[in-house]
């Protein structure tokens, strides 16, 4: 019962349905399944297509632009597990631009072991709000399910029984909503007892054996699982592979001869990209890990004496690293036979990921090009790079090329890093935060000084937004009042004192001490700092009686922290060297003063002997408010109050009921409700900076994913038609 069919290699099925039949006997796809780019298919083409044997995909399932496909319920009725051993851009299930898909219909899908789900731009897709993904995968918060028909609330999702007024499907709570769970109008989502974890359960709720994953035909029996939580061996699910078996592809046990066959098949074939499998830590794996080399007699990985060389030959002589995924392909490489192009625009935990994957590279035979890598601040992730040979050069005879890297501030820490560039020149243009001094240091260390021609290192577009001053200015005097700060700093004179044009004092309010110089500056001239130009002081010939330059900052807010720094303004010299000085950013708080008046006082009497008084804090506290002073004075009673006969029948009880005044800390809600009362004629509030930033990040993230998808999916046709089992992307 367990995996009744064959184990098939990963498949990329595109253009038409002919290759889809290769799935016919597959129980497990060891790899990924991509079905994509079928523009001529119609719904009737899928009517009789079904692959009921398919139980598990070890990597990911990707569906992209398959026309005519309306549901997966008949195509993959028994798909139970997607393991996500290797992911597509962090996703194990990707449904993207499926123009006719009306429902997912994967009603037996019980577990996505690793990775999350991306379902995007499917304008007919419903039955998404009825799926409780938390029952299928752990990292629900990483799911990205947007721009589907489901978003527009146009879906009339009806679970089985609903039309007859019954609730046949389990209901679970998500975001506080109690919703029936189903995949289609005829298939409920199976929800097992929480005690079963991800093992699955029978129809009546008895847990499957703890070695099962997703489902089983009988409870409590490791031979009756539909899929295995750990490893599969001879019709049974096991926690670990016993000797003489080895763990293979994270899901099954294989014997030595199986691993050996894979090794020799690859060795004897001329095919690029196949793996000569080896044995390490009871696993049959594609290659020895870093620090190990293969013993050819028994395929075992043995520790290297000293560093292990691992030469990586790049197809077509070069490789572009544009994501963590592409960097992973070079994991463990120590020598790159070819050239590297780094073009990284964004990503998570980048420095650590790049170091983990590229940090062992010691030598590049060609050139290294860093191009439009907005996400990079430093190249120190190339921790061991010692040699760029320059055997092949970028056009113009460059072996190191850095162009348009908006945030690159440091190449390497040259006090700790040696780099030799055997042949070729350096090219540096449009690296606005990279100081020329850093580039000149590289010339010296790498042995390329004197090779560069005049325009190879742009004097005006490198470091032009950076703080490249050599000397540190120190503040010598700071005095504060509630609205002023008096500053003085140590005098600074360049070698030719006439070069000093003055000082620029930068300041801004800074509630937190996390400000950097370039905060709030952009390419369009925005600047969040207030800048004051200050003339240089009179120069005295006696160094001991030098005037300390300074400035009195006026009109400041009381009890407010300001970030302040000062830098010199010096003439630009053509000898590639700019003198200057700059202070660190300091934080100075103005003194407290009297607060403004408390706002919106309200007094209400709630009994014959009490008055409740409430107010909002002052708009300008101008300090830490420790207490309020409340003054009251008894007023003379109105004589009418005494003369009135309170037993007169015509008197009405006061109609106003006492309700406590609003809470002082919630002024925003108070203001909001005032607007809301105006019969719905209110404007939507302008978006906050953080909302705008979030939307920008979101749209950038979407673009990055689409770029990645297109790069992976659109591959040039190969002239030969042979596709091997391990070819990751047949065209």
């Amino acid at each position: 019962h367990l995996y009744p069919g064959e184990v098939c290699p990963g498949m990329d099925i595109r253009n038409n349905l002919t290759r889809l039949h290769e799935l016919e006997n597959c129980s497990v796809i060891e790899g990924h399944l991509q079905i994509l780019l079928m523009f001529k298919t119609r719904p009737e083409d899928f009517r009789d297509l079904s692959f009921p044997k398919l139980i598990m995909i070890t990597d990911y399932l990707l569906l992209f632009r398959v026309y005519g496909l309306e549901s997966l319920k008949d195509l993959f009725p028994n798909l139970t597990v997607i393991r996500g051993s290797r992911l597509f851009f962090n996703y194990a299930l990707v449904i993207f631009e499926m123009v006719h898909l009306k429902e997912l219909g994967l009603y037996n899908l019980m577990n996505i072991t690793r990775g999350s789900v991306r379902i995007e731009k499917n304008n007919e897709l419903c039955y998404l709000a009825t799926i409780d993904w938390s029952r299928i995968l752990d990292s629900v918060e990483d799911n990205y399910i947007v721009l589907n028909k489901d978003d527009n609330e146009e879906c009339g999702d009806i679970c089985p029984g609903t039309a007859k007024g019954k609730t046949n499907c389990p209901a679970t709570v998500i975001n506080g909503q109690f919703v029936e769970r189903c995949w289609t109008h005829s298939h409920c989502q199976k929800v097992c007892p929480t005690i079963c974890k991800s093992h699955g359960c029978t129809a009546e709720g008895l847990c499957c054996h703890s070695e099962c994953l997703g489902n089983c035909s009988q409870p409590d029996d490791p031979t009756k699982c539909v899929a295995c939580r750990n490893f599969y061996l001879d019709g049974r699910c096991v926690e670990t592979c016993p000797p003489p078996y080895y763990h293979f592809q994270d899901w099954r046990c294989v014997n030595f001869s199986f691993c050996q066959d894979l090794h020799h098949k690859c060795k004897n074939s001329r095919r690029q990209g196949c793996h000569q499998y080896v044995i390490h830590n009871n696993k049959c794996i594609p290659e020895c890990p870093s620090g190990y080399t293969m013993n050819s007699s028994n395929l075992l990985c043995t520790p290297c004496l000293g560093p292990c060389p691992k030469v990586c030959h790049l197809l077509e002589g070069e490789k572009t690293i544009d994501s963590v995924t592409s960097a992973q392909e070079l994991r463990g490489c120590t020598v790159i036979n070819g050239s590297l192009i780094i073009n990284i625009r964004g990503g998570n935990n980048l420095a650590a990921e790049l170091e983990a994957n590229l940090g062992l590279i010691e030598e590049i035979s060609g050139y290294l090009k860093i191009r439009r890598s907005y996400a990079l601040v430093s190249l120190s992730f190339f921790r061991k790079l010692r040699l760029i040979r320059g055997e092949t050069l970028e056009i113009g005879n460059y072996s190191f090329y850095a162009l348009d890297n908006q945030n690159l501030r440091q190449l390497w820490d040259w006090s700790k890093h040696n780099l030799t560039i055997t042949q070729g020149k350096l090219f540096f243009h449009y690296n606005p935060k990279l100081c020329l001094s850093e580039i000149h240091k590289m010339e010296e260390v790498s042995g390329t000084k004197g090779r560069q021609e005049r325009n190879d290192i742009a004097l005006k577009t490198n470091g032009d937004q950076a703080s490249c001053e050599n000397e540190l200015l120190k503040f010598s005097y700071i005095r504060t009042s509630f609205d002023k700060i008096l500053l003085r700093w140590e005098p600074y004179w360049p070698p030719d004192f006439r070069d000093l044009l003055g000082f620029m004092l930068f300041y801004k309010e800074a509630p937190y001490q996390n400000v950097t110089e370039f905060d709030g500056q952009d390419a369009c001239g925005s600047n969040s700092w207030t800048v004051v130009d200050i003339d240089p002081p009179l120069r005295s010939n006696d160094p001991k009686s030098q005037n300390h330059p300074g400035w009195l900052m006026r009109g400041l807010k009381p009890w407010t922290q300001y970030a302040i720094f000062v830098k010199t303004l010096v003439t630009f010299s053509d000898e590639r060297r700019t003198y200057g000085a700059k202070s660190d950013i300091i934080y100075v708080q103005t003194d407290a003063t009297n607060p403004s008046v408390p706002l919106d006082p309200i007094s209400v009497s709630n009994s014959s002997s009490q008055i409740i008084l409430k107010w909002k804090p002052p708009s300008d506290p101008n300090g830490n408010i420790t207490h309020y002073l409340v003054f009251w004075e008894r007023q003379a009673e109105d004589s009418e109050l005494f003369e009135l006969d309170y037993c007169l029948k015509g008197l009405k009880l006061p109609s106003r009921t006492w309700s406590p005044p609003f809470e002082s800390e919630d002024s925003q809600k108070h203001n909001q409700s005032e607007y809301e009362d105006s019969a719905g004629e209110c404007c939507s509030c302008p978006k906050t900076d953080s909302q705008i930033l979030k939307e920008l990040e979101e749209s950038s993230f979407r673009k990055t994913f689409e770029d990645y998808l297109h790069n992976v999916v659109f591959v040039p046709r190969k002239t030969s038609s042979g596709t091997g089992a391990e070819d990751p992307r047949p065209s």
Epitope: P170, A171, T172, V173, F178, V191, C192, P193, T194, I195, E204, G205, L206, C207, H209, S210, P219, D220
Partner: antibody, heavy 121, light 107 residues
Framework: QVQLVESGGGLVQPGGSLRLSCAAS????????MSWVRQAPGKGLEWVSA????????YYADSVKGRFTISRDNSKNTLYLQMNSLRAEDTAVYYC??????????????WGQGTLVTVSS | AIQLTQSPSSLSASVGDRVTISCRAS??????LNWYQQKPGKAPNLLIY???SLQSGVPSRFSGSGSGTDFTLTIAGLQPEDFATYYC?????????FGGGTKLEIK
């Protein structure tokens, strides 16, 4: 047919200990999870503890965690409940019950006749 | 822990009556609920498992329904031997919990 017979109940002082046993017959004992459920005089049922068929997994109600220990001897077809630091509120009839399968699924069928534990000074 | 609230806590009925006992869970337990019958001085007996499946040997006048948080035990045509206390019990998550019981008495 399946039979479960509890023993070991009796009177014990607060802070004292007691060990209950449940002798099973009529089924393959090691293939089934077992549970203890108690019922205070005139009150409802309260699940106390469960153990898987192999004895590898144990589960407890919060009210007894750290004081009671469930165990089994599959060679003797016997289930045990070691009760320490007993309190007056532990006074109840203690039933042992067989589960439907080897994992503790919480299906109690059948039950033993019960044994009374009285905690009093 | 999941709380189960049974209602009513006691109920009087006559032979031949149709009675329903309700059990409400503090959170969704899908259909993972059992019903037991207990007669005085005796151990409980499993009547209904997984909300609606009849345990073998139990008369067909007993039936169970419901899912999510609301469940019902129905006895269609009470017999003299049905006067007892009835308990619901969830097996969705640890710790397993029982309802407070419903005592069914002869009117």
């Amino acid at each position: 047919q399946v039979q479960l017979v509890e023993s070991g109940g009796g009177l014990v002082q607060p802070g004292g200990s007691l060990r209950l046993s449940c002798a099973a017959s009529g089924f393959t004992f090691s293939s089934y999870a077992m549970s203890w459920v108690r019922q205070a005089p005139g009150k409802g049922l309260e699940w106390v503890s469960a153990i898987s068929g192999s004895g590898g997994s144990t589960y407890y109600a919060d009210s007894v965690k750290g004081r009671f220990t469930i165990s089994r001897d599959n060679s003797k077809n016997t289930l045990y409940l070691q009760m320490n630091s007993l309190r007056a509120e532990d006074t109840a009839v203690y039933y042992c019950a067989k589960d439907r399968v080897g994992a503790a699924n919480g299906w109690f069928d059948p039950w033993g006749q019960g044994t009374l534990v009285t905690v009093s000074s | 822990a999941i709380q189960l609230t049974q209602s009513p806590s006691s109920l009087s009925a006559s032979v031949g009556d149709r009675v329903t006992i309700s059990c409400r869970a503090s959170q969704s337990i899908t259909s993972y609920l059992n019903w037991y019958q207990q007669k005085p001085g005796k151990a409980p007996n499993l009547l209904i498992y997984a909300a609606s499946s009849l345990q073998s040997g139990v008369p067909s006048r007993f039936s169970g329904s419901g899912s999510g948080t609301d469940f019902t035990l129905t006895i269609a045509g009470l017999q003299p031997e049905d006067f007892a206390t009835y308990y619901c019990q969830q097996f969705d998550s640890y710790p397993f919990t029982f309802g407070g019981g419903t005592k069914l008495e002869i009117k």
